[in-house]
C-alpha cells in the first residue's frame, strides 16, 4: 500500500464491488417484475458515483440522491418489517410471509446489505485495503449515511401497523444507538403510522420472562407515545415455532404460547 | 385446532341493533387477528370488520364505517360485532374468522386460518 494512502480502522471495500452490485441489480429486477424498467448499469453508475473521488469521511445524504431516485420504489406501506441486531431471523420471516418487507427485501436494500465500500478523496479508485469505521473513525462514511438514508426513507414510507423485531437476548434489547432506535423510530410518521408493534425474539430456549417489560422496551414504549403512535409488544419465546406457525398457521401448536 | 362459534344472530328491524360474538372453545385468541365477513344470499363473501391480536387496531368496509364496532376480550378469548342503525342490506350470514398474527391485518378471506360456522342476521324494512 503506498504510504500516502490512508489507513482506517474498518474493513476495505468488499471485494468484486462493483460486480457483485451489477449482479445484485440484475438478479433483482429479474425476480420483481416491478422492477424490471430499471437500467442496472445507470443504477451503478450512480452507486458509484455517490462515494468516488469524495473523502471517506464527507459523504452526506445528497451524494446519494440520484441513486435514490433510480432506487424508487413502492412496497405496501402497511406491510413494512423493520428489526434491528436480528436480521436473520428478519429475513427468514419475509421469505416465508412475502407479503411483508424488510429494507433488505427492497431492491437499494438488497444491493448493498453486508457490503462495504469507499473510495479516496481526488482518485477514482475505490479502496479495497480499508474503509472508516463508524466509531473510530467518523460517521459520516459511504456506507453509514447509505444506510441512514434509506433507513430514513423507509421508515418515512411505513403507514398503518409497523412491525418491528427485536432481539431479546441483548443486553439493550431497545439500543437508542441502532438504526433503528436513531434514525426509523424517528422518521416514522404519526399521521400516517398508527402504531409501532414490537416483536421480541427470545434466545434461550427456557426463558419465559415477559421481556416486553424490560426498561428498554418502556423507553421505546415512551419514546413512541411521545410521537403520538401507539405500542404495542409481543413476546417471541420459541422463533423456531414462530417461522413454523407462519408456514403453517392451523397447526394446533399455534394457538398456544409461540 | 381452533373452533370458532358466533351467536347473536337474528331478525331486527331497520334501525335497530345487534351484537354478535365469537367465541373460541379451549384455544387462545392471542395470537391471532380476528375477522367478520359476511356472505348475503347469491353474492361473494365480503369483509367487514377486523381487529388485530392486541385490539388496538380496527379496520372496516366503508359501509359500515361508524355503525359497527369490532373489539375483543382475550381473557374471555371472544371477538364482538356491535351493529348499530342497520339495514336491510346488511341482511346475511355473518361469520368470524382467525387469522395468524404475523402479517398485516387481512381484508382477504384466503389469509384466515380458522372459520366459525356463521350466525344470520336478518334486517327487515
Known amino acids: 500500500v503506498p504510504r500516502w494512502r490512508q489507513q482506517w480502522s474498518g474493513p476495505g471495500t468488499t471485494k468484486r464491488f462493483p460486480e457483485t452490485v451489477l449482479a445484485r441489480c440484475v438478479k433483482y429486477t429479474e425476480i420483481h417484475p416491478e422492477m424490471r424498467h430499471v437500467d442496472c448499469q445507470s443504477v451503478w453508475d450512480a452507486f458509484k458515483g455517490a462515494f468516488i473521488s469524495k473523502h471517506p469521511c464527507n459523504i452526506t445524504e445528497e451524494d446519494y440522491q440520484p441513486l435514490m431516485k433510480l432506487g424508487t420504489q413502492t412496497v405496501p406501506c402497511n406491510k413494512i418489517l423493520l428489526w434491528s441486531r436480528i436480521k436473520d431471523l428478519a429475513h427468514q420471516f419475509t421469505q416465508v410471509q412475502r407479503d411483508m418487507f424488510t429494507l433488505e427485501d427492497t431492491l437499494l436494500g438488497y444491493l448493498a446489505d453486508d457490503l462495504t465500500w469507499c473510495g479516496e478523496f481526488n482518485t477514482s479508485k475505490i479502496n479495497y485495503q480499508s474503509c472508516p469505521d463508524w466509531r473510530k473513525d467518523c460517521s459520516n462514511n459511504p456506507v453509514s449515511v447509505f444506510w441512514k438514508t434509506v433507513s430514513r426513507r423507509f421508515a418515512e414510507a411505513a403507514c398503518d401497523v409497523v412491525h418491528v423485531m427485536l432481539n431479546g437476548s441483548r443486553s439493550k434489547i431497545f439500543d437508542k444507538n441502532s438504526t433503528f432506535g436513531s434514525v426509523e423510530v424517528h422518521n416514522l410518521q404519526p399521521e400516517k403510522v398508527q402504531t409501532l408493534e414490537a416483536w421480541v425474539i427470545h434466545g434461550g430456549r427456557e426463558d419465559s420472562r415477559d421481556l416486553c417489560q424490560d426498561p428498554t422496551i418502556k423507553e421505546l414504549e415512551s419514546i413512541i407515545s411521545k410521537r403520538n403512535i401507539q405500542f404495542s409488544c409481543k413476546n417471541i419465546y420459541r422463533p423456531d415455532k414462530f417461522l413454523q406457525c407462519v408456514k403453517n398457521p392451523e397447526d394446533s401448536s399455534c394457538t398456544s404460547e409461540i | 385446532e381452533v373452533q370458532l362459534e358466533e351467536s347473536g344472530g337474528g331478525l331486527v328491524q331497520a334501525g335497530g341493533s345487534l351484537r354478535l360474538s365469537c367465541a373460541a372453545s379451549g384455544r387462545t385468541l392471542s395470537n391471532y387477528h380476528m375477522g367478520w365477513f359476511r356472505q348475503a344470499p347469491g353474492k361473494e363473501r365480503e369483509f367487514v370488520a377486523a381487529?388485530?391480536?392486541?385490539?388496538?387496531?380496527?379496520y372496516y368496509m366503508d359501509s359500515v364505517k361508524g355503525r359497527f364496532t369490532v373489539s375483543r376480550d382475550n381473557a374471555k378469548n371472544t371477538v364482538y360485532l356491535q351493529m348499530n342503525s342497520l339495514k336491510p342490506e346488511d341482511t346475511a350470514v355473518y361469520y368470524c374468522a382467525a387469522q395468524f398474527f404475523a402479517a398485516a391485518v387481512g381484508r382477504d378471506s384466503a389469509k384466515y386460518a380458522y372459520w366459525g360456522q356463521g350466525t344470520q342476521v336478518t334486517v327487515s324494512s
Open positions: 381487529i388485530n391480536w392486541s385490539g388496538l387496531n380496527t
